[in-house]
């Protein structure tokens, strides 16, 4: 596949990764739908560093991440180990909360007004960020 | 100038097979997520397939999904949509379709003159 | 899937009047909205996105109006051209989804 060495129009370049930061809301299905499509995924955050750069970006605006548990466990969209990676939860969150009175409990991280995460129903309209990985090779079709 | 022409439509029985092609030209084909859409006769358009530039992900509409698959050809600027298990329902004038190239931005800047698939014993 | 109606389904007016169409969705869209203008046998052409922005070389007597779940386009005053079908799609939601089209005929 190509390579992409430089980010495109209108993303911002950080730490070897092309990042894209939404002015409008959507699901986080939808959100992660318009990633995939320009070959990017949901923000996957992975150090205290990426945080505040995402956090710096975003403002005190509820915005969605590409983490989630809509399968059971807590998964990062690009395979990173939950377990052990980044988090930055706020206190008593996750906690799948099922008093919104929308059905189901929670399963869809979001940055929060002070950047730490919590989780909440997936089909809020909540702005999103996309990521992108410079220097790696693009991916290609799977072969049928 | 943005040129998109599709091919490879025609009459097929129910549950056969078809390969469209759409050969693109006058943009950079490799940094545009594209798309095919459909018109029945006498009806409305309605999405069928994406796939972002490179490829490597790709969306389907339910009525389709499991017997289309949408591929792209970047070397050779050609956006493709192999369809099987056909049933008289897919009868319509398929569009191949570039997307507007922003985020978030699901519209449609540029359209083929499409290739009208007919499924009929 | 997010629902698009269109009304009406024709519009009849003579040329050089105002002609205005509708598009509602069964749930907010919020200003994910595009129109189209499709002439018998042609591919459709994009007019307007993101509700009211007029898409490039699209004259200034097309406008486009609305969020949420109520759009209006608005064709100030009619060309031979603008007999055709108008198609209003979404793009908040996948899938995208497009209303089934008005026909503006020749009074």
């Known amino acids: 596949g190509s390579e992409r060495t430089c980010c495109p129009v209108n993303w911002v370049e950080h730490e070897r990764s092309c990042y894209w930061f939404s002015r409008s809301g959507k699901a986080w299905a939808d959100a992660d739908n318009y990633c995939r499509l320009e070959d990017a995924h949901l923000v996957v955050v992975t150090s205290w560093e990426e945080q505040k750069f995402v956090q710096h970006h975003i403002g005190p605006v509820n915005t969605w991440m590409g983490l989630h548990d809509q399968n059971g466990p807590w998964k990062w969209v690009d395979g990173t180990d939950y377990e052990t990676g980044f988090k930055n939860w706020r206190p008593e969150q996750p906690d799948d909360w099922y008093g919104h009175g929308l059905g189901g409990g929670e399963d869809c991280a979001h940055f929060t007004d002070d950047g730490r995460w919590n989780d909440d129903v997936c089909q809020r309209p909540y702005r999103w960020v996309c990521e992108t990985e410079l220097d790696k090779a693009s991916q290609e079709p799977p072969l049928l | 100038e943005v040129q998109l022409l599709e091919s490879g439509g025609g009459l097929v029985q129910p549950g056969g097979s078809l390969r469209l092609s759409c050969a693109a030209s006058?943009?950079?084909?490799?940094?545009?997520?594209m798309s095919w859409v459909r018109q029945a006769p006498g009806k409305g358009l309605e999405w069928v397939s994406a796939i972002s530039g490179s490829g490597g992900n790709t969306f389907y509409a339910d009525s389709v999904k499991g017997r289309f698959t949408i591929s792209r050809d970047n070397s050779k600027n050609t956006l493709f949509l192999q369809m099987n298990s056909l049933r008289a329902e897919d009868t319509a004038v398929y569009y191949c379709?570039?997307?507007?190239?922003?985020?978030?931005?699901?519209?449609?800047?540029?359209w083929g003159q499409g290739t009208l698939v007919t499924v009929s014993s | 899937e997010i629902v698009m109606t269109q009304s009406p389904a024709t519009l009849s007016v003579s040329p050089g009047e105002r002609a205005t169409l509708s598009c509602r969705a069964s749930q907010s869209v919020s200003s994910s909205l595009a129109w189209y203008r499709q002439k018998p046998g042609q591919a459709p052409r994009l007019l307007i996105y993101g509700a009211s922005t007029r898409a490039t070389g699209i004259p200034a007597r097309f406008s486009g109006s609305g969020s949420g779940t109520e759009f209006t386009l608005t064709i100030s005053s009619l060309q031979s051209e603008d007999f055709a079908v108008y198609c209003c799609?979404?793009?908040?939601?996948?899938?995208?989804?497009f209303g089934p089209g008005t026909k503006i005929d020749i009074k």
């Open positions: 379709a570039k997307f507007f190239g922003i985020v978030g931005a699901g519209y449609f800047d540029y």
């Open positions: 006058g943009f950079t084909f490799s940094s545009y997520a």
């Open positions: 799609q979404q793009y908040n939601n996948w899938p995208f989804t």
